[in-house]
Interface confidence: low
């Protein structure tokens, strides 16, 4: 059957492979056609990076289906974890690096459940499936570690119209989170949501727990006036 | 369409700076790679630097090594050539090209510039 | 640093004509090696990358080879819009080098 490989500059090439195939073979394949050591080369279908040893049957890789080339790079890049209580872990990390693998990478280092863990960047919490080209981590990069709550906690917005809404968050999550959670709730943009608690208006790149919200809080949304 | 655009090149006296812009329009340089490559008179193609601006990597020519850096503006979609302790060596045309295989070490240059030239002299 | 020996460094030749150009590389370079034409004042342009593989636009008079560490670029029917400099480049490794170029003139 053919399968495609398509680059990060857009360029396609087509590989006559069998089902039973390994992904080492189809490194092989590439390196045939283009001369890139298999070392240096890393496939990614529907956002997993593929293993070696795999087949393409064993990721449901049919014919004509897509897959995308990225190289390693030579020794990678450091990019460093802070956790909450200050402490700083370096990670030898490369661009293509998907969420799962660095949050992977800080379980072998400090034992940390991957499902425990939130990494955030540049107030975005980071999604698993993304990789840290994705979100423009580049070398020497700082992500910040929060442990995720088992189960999490209520909280409740209030509008102006008396409507209450509750929402399922995390003293992790950061009040652009909790915006996109009102907008999958009730169809509001973030950027015409405002919150407000103890007085205070809320701060995108912030988190929850900077602002002292606990369980069963009451938030006040006040929308933003277009133009306004 | 693809298209690159050099500029900035002109009459310097040695040991002189200059700094070559490389504007990109018809593709992402973040995605891709940039590279300079210099023609001096009547001579041969001679490889200068690259960026990966995707990798955060770059590659000098050891004739050129701590005397020019490159660097991209991926907002502007411009890569530079800042070009220090210039040497009458250094006279070419330089030329920005695109990278077209993907192997970040060294790949073939599909996309072109129509060249800038530099002359060190005194 | 992989060098990259072209030959010839001129030659004449008629249209209609079949044209061969050969480069070594000094190490292996796998089929890493791409072919280029320039014309006086203009910049290069890709004919053949991957040894073999014709770019995109480029006639199919053009064609590349590779045996071991020698790579040919063979224009089977020379055309009047031919006659140009052609160079070789390994794309293998950094730095990427080319070869000296070879001028291909009107008989």
């Known amino acids: 059957m053919q399968i495609f490989v398509k680059t990060l500059t857009g360029k396609t090439i087509t590989l006559e492979v069998e089902p039973s195939d390994t992904i080492e073979n189809v490194k092989a394949k590439i390196q045939d056609k283009e001369g890139i050591p298999p070392d240096q080369q890393r496939l990614i279908f529907a956002g997993k990076q593929l293993e070696d040893g795999r087949t393409l049957s064993d990721y449901n890789i049919q014919k004509e289906s897509t897959l995308h080339l990225v190289l390693r790079l030579r020794g990678g890049m450091q990019i460093f974890v802070k956790t909450l209580t200050g402490k700083t872990i370096t990670l030898e990390v490369e661009p293509s690096d998907t969420i799962e693998n660095v949050k992977a990478k800080i379980q072998d280092k400090e034992g940390i459940p991957p499902d425990q863990q939130r990494l955030i960047f540049a107030g975005k919490q980071l999604e698993d499936g993304r990789t840290l080209s994705d979100y423009n981590i580049q070398k020497e990069s700082t992500l910040h570690l929060v442990l995720r709550l088992r189960g999490g906690m209520q909280i409740f917005v209030k509008t102006l119209t008396g409507k209450t809404i509750t929402l399922e968050v995390e003293p992790s999550d950061t009040i652009e989170n909790v915006k996109a959670k009102i907008q999958d709730k009730e169809g509001i943009p973030p950027d015409q949501q405002r919150l407000i608690f103890a007085g205070k208006q809320l701060e995108d790149g912030r988190t929850l727990s900077d602002y002292n919200i606990q369980k069963e809080s009451t938030l006040h949304l006040v929308l933003r006036l277009r133009g306004g | 369409e693809v298209q690159l655009v050099e500029s900035g090149g002109g009459l310097v006296q040695p040991g002189g700076s200059l700094r070559l812009s490389c504007a990109a329009s018809g593709f992402n340089i973040y995605y891709s790679s940039i590279h300079w490559v210099r023609q001096a008179p009547g001579k041969g193609l001679e490889w200068v630097a690259s960026i990966y601006p995707y990798y955060g990597y770059t590659s000098y020519a050891d004739s050129v090594k701590g005397r020019f850096t490159i660097s991209a503006d991926t907002s502007k979609n411009t890569a530079y050539l800042q070009m220090n302790s210039l040497r009458a060596e250094d006279t070419a045309v330089y030329y920005c090209?695109?990278?077209?295989?993907?192997?970040?070490?060294?790949?073939?240059?599909?996309?072109w510039g129509q060249g800038t030239l530099v002359t060190v002299s005194s | 640093d992989i060098q990259m020996t072209q030959s010839p460094s001129s030659l004449s030749a008629s249209v209609g004509d079949r044209v061969t150009i050969t480069c070594r590389a000094s190490?292996?370079?796998?089929?890493?090696v791409a072919w280029y034409q320039q014309k006086p004042g203009k910049a290069p342009k890709l004919l053949i990358y991957s040894a073999s593989s014709l770019y995109s636009g480029v006639p199919s008079r053009f064609s590349g080879s590779r045996s071991g560490t020698d790579f040919t670029l063979t224009i089977s029917s020379l055309q009047p819009e031919d006659f140009a400099t052609y160079y070789c480049?390994?794309?293998?490794?950094?730095?990427?080098?080319f070869g000296q170029g070879t001028k291909v003139e009107i008989k």
């Open positions: 480049q390994q794309h293998y490794t950094t730095p990427p080098t």
């Open positions: 190490q292996s370079v796998s089929s890493a």
């Open positions: 090209a695109r990278g077209y295989s993907w192997y970040y070490g060294s790949p073939a240059f599909d996309y």
